[in-house]
């Protein structure tokens, strides 16, 4: 039961950085995406501000804060209509994430 090269362990995620040269000289675009191999009953989500496999029922009910999406010490609050969540740092700075 060894993993093949490039294969993710079940229940884990990795961040994939896509580099591509733009048509403009000396400008490089970088974008990040997550690759997850989630177990049965799980779905790709966010835990501690990183990609993670989370309980699929959290996504179904839109109880986003149940993913523990914020860093430890930050407060999580649902956006109105459960369209996403906010993470509030101890200093008061707020980071908002919306789910499309």
């Amino acid at each position: 039961q060894f993993l093949k090269e490039g294969q993710l362990a079940a229940g884990t995620c990795e961040i994939v950085t896509l580099d591509r040269d733009s048509s403009q000289p000396r400008i490089e675009e970088r974008s990040q995406t997550a690759r997850c191999a989630c177990r049965k009953g799980q779905i790709a989500g966010t835990t501690r501000a990183r990609p993670a496999c989370v309980d699929a029922r959290i996504i179904k009910t839109k109880q986003w804060c149940d993913m523990l999406p914020c860093l430890e010490g930050e407060g999580c609050d649902l956006l109105i209509n459960r369209s996403g969540w906010t993470c509030t740092q101890p200093g008061g700075r707020i980071k908002t994430t919306t789910v499309s």
């Epitope: 079940a10 177990r39 049965k40 407060g75 999580c76």
Partner: antibody, heavy 113, light 107 residues
Framework: QSLEESGGRLVTPGTPLTLTCTAS????????MNWVRQAPGKGLEWIGI?????TTYYAGWAKGRFTISKTSTTVDLKITSPTSEDTATYFC??????????WGPGTLVTVSL | ELDLTQTPPSLSASVGGTVTINCLAS??????LAWYQQKPGKPPTLLIS???NLESGVPPRFSGSGSGTDYTLTIGGVQAEDAATYFC?????????FGAGTNVEIK
Amino acid sequence: QSLEESGGRLVTPGTPLTLTCTASGFSLSSYYMNWVRQAPGKGLEWIGIIYPSGTTYYAGWAKGRFTISKTSTTVDLKITSPTSEDTATYFCARTVSGYFDIWGPGTLVTVSL
Amino acid sequence: ELDLTQTPPSLSASVGGTVTINCLASEDIYSALAWYQQKPGKPPTLLISGTSNLESGVPPRFSGSGSGTDYTLTIGGVQAEDAATYFCQGYSSYPLTFGAGTNVEIK
């Protein structure tokens, strides 16, 4: 960062009992909180878990026998109708990924006439 | 429902020796396995998560391995303070499940 359970005592069978878990040094809303018990000289039994929203999941044997609830500062475990089989040390423990990184010292519940 | 069979139930080891404890899962748990140490009158303490990830502050003589349904905790160069009961725990799905425990005595 620590957890502490309270409320354990000698109760008569059928008398509901509520145990309380209090966290120090971290916010309960940033973790999944669990209750685990251990009968004298026996192994560990997971009772259930509560999410920040209040969503709960229980072990099959624990459904109907226990209720987990929370406030902003505590997590409670209610033993609805204790029997002698519920005599045990009850621990609260926190998790993010399914394993328990911090445990309370435990509180002893004795059910006897 | 996941069942974890932990063997042996108890063992005796000499200081400096090696201890091996096994945990057999009734189904593939995809390396979602943790190990705990518990001493009398105390709560368990986490030693290893994710089959082989040593917790901060845990001596390197403790190690974990395995995959699929078979997992092992090894204590190399056993010390007197390692006398305790050891539990495995699976967390691939609910309900979270513990093995029955292995009591380790040091001679």
